[in-house]
Interface confidence: medium
């Protein structure tokens, strides 16, 4: 018995073939002996079968001795045993179909999990196998299941039903709603505007939901909220605002949020949250601001940082085209007495420069000049 | 017969294009997965690439953006397109089916070299 | 991206004798997605086990394959003079589909 595998949803077209090439008598009929359709002279017939709105066949083929039963929008109950009955021989197609669905929204969150539902027809013993965007590959049986999702599972899912040593199959579609980056970090000097950018890894027609910046200021004991706002089709509008320090934000999409100036005491780290409607669970980012200040009071050139900083990073003072005159792993450095000239403080990763700041130290019998 | 079929190696200059081709014949190619796998002189294999049955595409870090993995089911033939040749990339290069279900690569050609020289 | 070891490096032994090779993981495999080939010089590879544990069509069965998780293991009960070649085993449960580097099985 020839085995024929089906999708839900799609068109299936069980074949039956004549020897002798020309149109003679057919029928289709199923396990219980019910006629589908077949075929009077050149007119095609259908019987009181279940599938009779669904069910067709190609006249242009019965010349050739073909005699097709196409069978649209195909169900899982459609699974059965077909037989063409032609030229006193009896061909006996076996349809299994199967459904593969989402058990939830195909959008989800990061971190979320995805479950993925095998519709199989009574008596099947299909495996199925489903490949990820970035090449994972799981398998299970009528239920599979996926947990922490990650960006990188945003894409197309491929999976494939196996029975009978043969293969359907399936495309899903699935969307990680997420941030484009978990963290992120932006080092500022004492004073200047400070720029926070929080771009979506996903592209919806309507984004609705609402959100919070909550601040851990280095100095501070406890973290406190620095901004809410509401987002509705993609537009976003200011609910509370702190005082101190005032923060303006982007009427439109990116999220996108300005700090007037960068400050010791606003230096630390961030967490943006964003809560989507329909959603449950919020959408995270980081976002930490590293600031520095260089100064010099009396006789003491200083450099300093606040902020989350990496053990790894170097603090350097060097006077211009010079070598470096103190260089520590630490977020002070100073240098007593230092000479007339344009002094740079640096902040370093294995050599690569993250942050500068420049103070113009003037012959002892002047005052300081910083640009 | 099941049967794999590389062509197109040869030598190439670093900074060079090649395009590698794998005839197969004997099974339904449609149906399966296809892989490129690579071997250096003297050195084990490693993985340059596959192509699912949907057409999606997955390589590793040491290609990417360089190798292009194409297949054309009508003339059951696999494809791999190499930019950028570096020295690096000079090995036989084999193309492998993907056993029923992605079961270990079960049928193997017999390879072509790439060398990459100047 | 996963790593795969493979250990002894280098096995000698003599026909007859029984090979255990070893193939660690660096982080866990779905043993549905354990391979084990071998290559003889100047040949290409050849699947013997698949799924850890099931041997690909026409391999003899002194051929097995056992393990789960990290560790996984090739067992050839009964060298055969034709069995002395290199053995890889390969993850193709996530991507990049690695192969551990070999282990040689030479006379002894």
């Known amino acids: 018995k020839k085995v024929v595998l089906g999708k839900k949803g799609d068109t299936v077209e069980l074949t039956c073939t004549a020897s002798q090439k020309k149109s003679i008598q057919f029928h289709w009929k199923n396990s219980n002996q019910i006629k589908i359709l077949g075929n009077q002279g050149s007119f095609l017939t259908k019987g009181p079968s279940k599938l009779n709105d669904r069910a067709d066949s190609r006249r242009s083929l019965w010349d050739q001795g073909n005699f097709p039963l196409i069978i649209k929008n195909l169900k899982i109950e459609d699974s059965d045993t077909y037989i063409c009955e032609v030229e006193d021989q009896k061909e006996e197609v076996q349809l299994l179909v199967f459904g593969l669905t989402a058990n939830s929204d195909t959008h989800l969150l990061q971190g979320q999990s995805l479950t993925l539902t095998l519709e199989s027809p009574p008596g099947s013993s299909p495996s199925v196998q489903c490949r990820s965007p970035r090449g994972k590959n799981i398998q299970g049986g009528k239920t599979l299941s996926v947990s922490q999702l990650e960006l990188q599972d945003s894409g197309t899912w491929t999976c494939t039903v196996l029975q009978n040593q043969k293969k359907v199959e399936f495309k899903i579609d699935i969307v990680v709603l997420a941030f484009q980056k978990a963290s992120s970090i932006v080092y500022k000097k004492e004073g200047e505007q400070v720029e926070f950018s929080f771009p979506l890894a996903f592209t919806v027609e309507k984004l609705t939901g609402s959100g919070e910046l909550w601040w851990q200021a280095e100095r501070a004991s406890s973290s406190k909220s620095w901004i809410t706002f509401d987002l509705k089709n993609k537009e976003v509008s200011v609910k509370r605002v702190t005082q101190d320090p005032k923060l303006q934000m982007g009427k439109k999409l990116p999220l996108h949020l300005t700090l007037p100036q960068a400050l010791p005491q606003y230096a630390g780290s961030g967490n943006l949250t964003l809560a989507l409607e329909a959603k449950t669970g919020k959408l995270h980012q980081e976002v930490n601001l590293v600031v520095m200040r260089a100064t010099q009071l009396q006789k003491n050139l200083t450099c300093e940082v606040w902020g989350p900083t990496s053990p790894k990073l170097m603090l350097s003072l060097k006077l211009e085209n010079k070598e470096a005159k103190v260089s520590k792993r630490e977020k002070a450095v100073w240098v007593l007495n230092p000479e007339a000239g344009m002094w740079q403080c640096l902040l370093s990763d294995s050599g690569q420069v993250l942050l500068e700041s420049n103070i113009k130290v003037l012959p002892t019998w002047s005052t300081p000049v910083q640009p | 017969e099941v049967q794999l079929v590389e062509s197109g190696g040869g030598l190439v200059q670093p900074g060079g294009s090649l395009r590698l081709s794998c005839a197969a014949s004997?099974?339904?190619?449609?149906?399966?997965?296809m892989h490129w796998v690579r071997q250096a002189t003297g050195k084990g294999l490693e993985w340059v690439s596959t192509i699912g049955t949907a057409g999606d595409t997955y390589y590793p870090g040491s290609v990417k953006g360089r190798f292009t993995i194409s297949r054309e089911n009508a003339k059951n033939s696999l494809y791999l397109q190499m930019n950028s040749l570096r020295a690096g990339d000079t090995a036989v290069y084999y193309c492998a089916r993907g056993g029923d279900f992605y079961y270990g690569l079960d049928v193997w050609g017999q390879g072509t070299t790439v060398t990459v020289s100047s | 991206e996963i790593m795969l070891t493979q250990s002894p490096g280098t096995l000698s032994l003599s026909p007859g004798e029984r090979a255990t090779l070893s193939c660690r993981a660096s982080q866990s495999v779905s043993s549905v997605y354990l391979a084990w080939y071998q290559q003889k010089p100047g040949q290409a590879p050849r699947l013997l086990i698949y799924?850890?544990?099931s041997r690909a069509t026409g391999i003899p069965d002194r051929f097995s394959g056992s393990g789960s998780g990290t560790d996984f293991t090739l067992t050839i009960s009964r060298l055969e003079p034709e069995d002395f070649a290199v053995y890889y085993c390969q993850q193709y449960g996530s991507s990049p589909f690695t192969f551990g580097p070999g282990t040689k099985v030479d006379f002894k």
């Open positions: 799924g850890a544990s």
């Open positions: 004997g099974f339904t190619f449609s149906n399966y997965d």
